[in-house]
């Protein structure tokens, strides 16, 4: 009898009520592997979640976050508010990056500008709240008489985060 069930493909279940015939998964359920005795109910993408991939008879629905939010955790198990580039999310909401830090994404924290001088280089393009500095050649590499117009950017102390 076990062998009969093992013949049931994904998208079906082994129906004990019908002499172990392979029955299709009912609506809003799925089986992703063969030989299942039941089909699993599909995940609902409701509230702060929206559907990224519809449930089918062989695979579960996949959720995403509604506009203005991004997923956290396994299988998009929590939604967190997006911020603008140049900001980070704090307990008080989205806050601009402090001077000397940047964030080029809608999520995550502000990070210190690269300290070009640590690599013996000079600042070619200044950093902003949205963009890191661009380091250029070291002052020694510049032709005589040429010098960097911008001093190296200060690095933020590790562990410091604006509240």
């Amino acid at each position: 009898l076990q062998d009969l069930c093992s013949n049931c493909p994904a998208g079906t279940f082994c129906d004990n009520n019908r002499s172990q015939i392979c029955s299709p998964c009912p609506p809003n359920s799925f089986s992703s592997a063969g030989g299942q005795r039941t089909c699993d109910i599909c995940r609902q993408c409701k509230g702060v979640f929206k559907t990224r991939k519809e449930c089918s008879s062989t695979s579960n629905a996949e959720c995403d976050c509604i506009s203005g939010y991004h997923c956290l955790g396994a299988e998009c198990s929590m939604c967190e508010q997006d911020c603008k580039q140049g900001q980070e999310l704090t307990k008080k909401g989205c806050k601009d990056c402090c001077f000397g830090t940047f964030n080029d994404q809608k999520r995550g924290i502000c990070r210190p500008w690269t300290n070009c001088s640590l690599d013996g280089k000079s600042v070619l393009v200044n950093g902003t709240k949205e963009r890191d500095v661009v380091c250029g050649p070291s002052p020694a590499d510049l032709s005589p008489g040429a010098s960097s117009a911008t001093p190296p950017a200060p690095a933020r102390e590790p562990g410091h985060s604006p509240q």
């Epitope: 699993d40 109910i41 995940r43 609902q44 409701k46 509230g47 702060v48 979640f49 579960n60 509604i66 203005g68 939010y69 956290l72 955790g73 396994a74 299988e75 998009c76 198990s77 929590m78 939604c79 967190e80 508010q81 307990k91 008080k92 909401g93 989205c94």
Partner: antibody
């Protein structure tokens, strides 16, 4: 820090309408879903329903259409009304922010239904 | 609706010991499960979401595991402030449902 502060009548007679309001301070109001949960004395938690800032709602079928949610985005507030209350509706009622799980909660309001 | 069942109803543990709380779903909910802590007279507090991810500010002694229908919350070394009631909750399907709770008390 996101804070939820709630208020409403604490003592009702059977058949009256329960009315509670929750104000959100700090953080964002728009975009999130806001929920109500209740807890009868000495018992577990029951989800009542939710509302988004846009006004879209969902509620627990167990409440059989007795529940109404509303939102006032100008004040960052949302409200619950539960009509035709009975002694079985006696509980601590909580408002909460729904981000998948409930990540921020109000302090709770004890509502007693007694004749 | 998905029924969530927690066991044991009460768990007696000495401070410093490990506590293991169980939660079972009536059908598979993947990892879409949260754990909350509630102390007397207070609102619940989110501990874990996605079955295993600690919420912001939650100490590392709290850990969650499991997937499908069987889930576990482990408190590695109980502190005095951890004695409380713990609830699991699924948000895989609506209506959202909670377990009946496990009270962790001092032995």
């Amino acid at each position: 820090q996101v804070q939820l502060q709630q208020w409403g009548a604490g003592l009702l007679k059977p058949s009256e309408t329960l009315s509670l309001t929750c104000a959100v301070y700090g953080g964002s109001f728009s975009g999130y879903y806001w929920s109500w949960i209740r807890q009868p004395p000495g018992k577990g938690l029951e989800w009542i329903g939710e509302i988004q800032h846009s006004g879209s709602t969902d509620s627990n079928p167990s409440l059989k259409g007795r529940v109404t949610f509303s939102v006032d985005t100008s004040k960052n507030q949302f409200s619950l009304k539960l009509n035709s209350v009975t002694a079985a509706d006696t509980a601590v009622y909580y408002c909460a922010r729904l981000t998948g799980p409930f990540d921020y909660w109000g302090q709770g309001t004890l509502v007693t239904v007694s004749s | 609706e998905i029924v969530m069942t927690q066991s044991p109803a009460t768990l007696s543990v000495s401070p410093g010991e490990r506590a293991t709380l169980s939660c079972r779903a009536s059908q598979s909910i993947s990892s879409i499960l949260a754990w909350y802590q509630q102390k007397p007279g207070q609102a619940p507090r989110l501990l874990i979401y996605g079955a295993s991810t600690r919420a912001t500010g939650i100490p590392a002694r709290f850990s969650g595991s499991g997937s499908g229908t069987e889930f576990t919350l482990t408190i590695s070394s109980l502190q005095s402030e951890d004695f409380a009631v713990y609830y699991c909750q699924q948000y895989y399907n609506w209506p959202l449902t909670f377990g009946g709770g496990t009270k962790v008390e001092i032995k």
